[in-house]
């Protein structure tokens, strides 16, 4: 029950996380104009991974996509790539994890197969989350670097007010959405990996049946084969019939010359 709950929760958390990564990638507010110490202006600028926007004080907004691909900064291209890889891996992970869910029965799929699929999707979610966190962090680092470079190039404007030559940009809402979403996807992935351990069958008993000549004779007992401990004895008494065939579970102490292996 706990395994199913962990797996289900991991799936839901990852689903929310990936939805957040998609939302962050599509959002326009990755960087927003820093309004601190800024000349009073009727317009407000903000940029995303795909387009740049200008908003008027009235609320009217005009946006324009980055049409050129080669002219874009390498860092922006890297962030785009990381976010897209995160989304693709996350989407594949979601697809795999749907089939891996313990509460969903698909044909005669064994628990070992479900465990493998759960582990695969968990790893995919972890990598997806890391890609998103890395992408957002690279962009944030770029903003911080540019912010302080702009601050270094200051001059004293009219009225003695210190101004920057360039407009400074600060963290937009998309960065926070991306960080949270990446974190959720990562947590979901870890939960799926934990659930995988509970899904994997820990021991497999192969019941050995031995046949002998006499009904009152003693059966050869190899001991139940255990995946974890090797050969071991089993103390359960389980009588099948009074004839020649007995299970390995039936404890017999004195082997006789009539036993056949």
């Amino acid at each position: 029950m706990a395994v199913t709950a962990c797996q289900g929760l991991g799936f839901v958390v990852s689903l929310i996380g990936i939805a957040g990564i998609i939302a962050a990638t599509c959002m326009d507010q990755w960087s927003t104009q820093d309004l601190y110490n800024n000349p009073v202006t009727a317009v407000f600028n903000y940029q995303g991974l795909w387009r740049s926007c200008v908003r008027e004080s009235s609320g009217f907004t005009e946006c324009r996509g980055y049409f050129t691909l080669l002219g874009l900064p390498a860092m922006l291209q890297a962030v785009r790539a990381l976010m897209i890889v995160g989304i693709v891996l996350g989407a594949i992970g979601l697809l795999v994890s749907i089939f891996a869910l313990k509460c969903i029965r698909i044909g005669s799929m064994e628990d070992s197969a479900k465990a493998n699929m759960t582990l695969t999707s968990g790893i995919m979610f972890i990598v997806s989350g890391l890609c998103a966190i890395a992408g957002v962090s690279v962009f944030a680092n770029m903003l911080v670097t540019n912010f302080w470079m702009s601050t270094a190039n200051m001059y004293t404007g009219m009225g003695g007010m210190v101004q920057t030559v360039q407009t400074r940009y600060t963290f937009g809402a998309a960065l926070f959405v991306g960080w949270v979403a990446g974190g959720l996807t990562l947590i979901g992935g870890v939960m799926m990996c934990i659930a995988c351990r509970g899904l994997a069958p820990e021991e497999t008993n192969y019941k050995a049946v031995s046949y002998h000549a006499s009904g009152h004779s003693v059966a050869y007992k190899p001991g139940g084969f255990k995946a974890s401990t090797g050969f071991g004895s089993n103390t359960k008494n389980k009588k099948i019939y009074d004839g020649g065939a007995r299970t390995e579970d039936e404890v017999q102490s004195y082997p006789s010359k009539h036993d056949y292996v």
Partner: nanobody
Framework: QVQLVESGGGLVQPGGSLRLSCAAS????????MGWFRQAPGKGLEFVAG????????DYADSVKGRFTIARDNSKNTLYLQMNSLRAEDAAVYYC????????????????WGQGTLVTVSS
């Protein structure tokens, strides 16, 4: 990269009008935010007006608001500045500038600049 050439400057009396033009060499003119800056003798660069890609949003310096009008014709790759009710303090070299992503009043945000056209206001 876009090349900008200003024209239309000259001598005008106070209260008069003048129309400046800025022709862009690049056919991707519509993908740039455009601005007009001016520099009076012995002073720094001052923002005059700016306009977004399609002309939907315009921004003006307080000193020119209501007197100057910025406009663009993307089919002709040209930016305009209509200057009315000119004053002595409007005399300066007017520069046309372009940048791809932001409409700001800071000269450092503009990547491409014209050579400038001189506007003289004198009686």
């Amino acid at each position: 990269q876009v090349q900008l050439v200003e024209s239309g400057g000259g001598l005008v009396q106070p209260g008069g009008s003048l129309r400046l033009s800025c022709a862009a060499s690049d056919s991707t003119f519509s993908s740039y935010i455009m601005g007009w800056f001016r520099q009076a003798p012995g002073k720094g660069l001052e923002f005059v007006a700016g306009i977004t890609w399609s002309g939907g949003i315009k921004d003006y310096a307080d000193s020119v608001k209501g007197r100057f009008t910025i406009a663009r014709d993307n089919s002709k790759n040209t930016l305009y500045l209509q200057m009315n009710s000119l004053r002595a303090e409007d005399a300066a070299v007017y520069y046309c500038a372009a940048n791809a992503i932001q409409l700001t009043r800071r000269s450092g945000d503009y990547a491409y600049w014209g050579q400038g056209t001189l506007v003289t206001v004198s009686s």
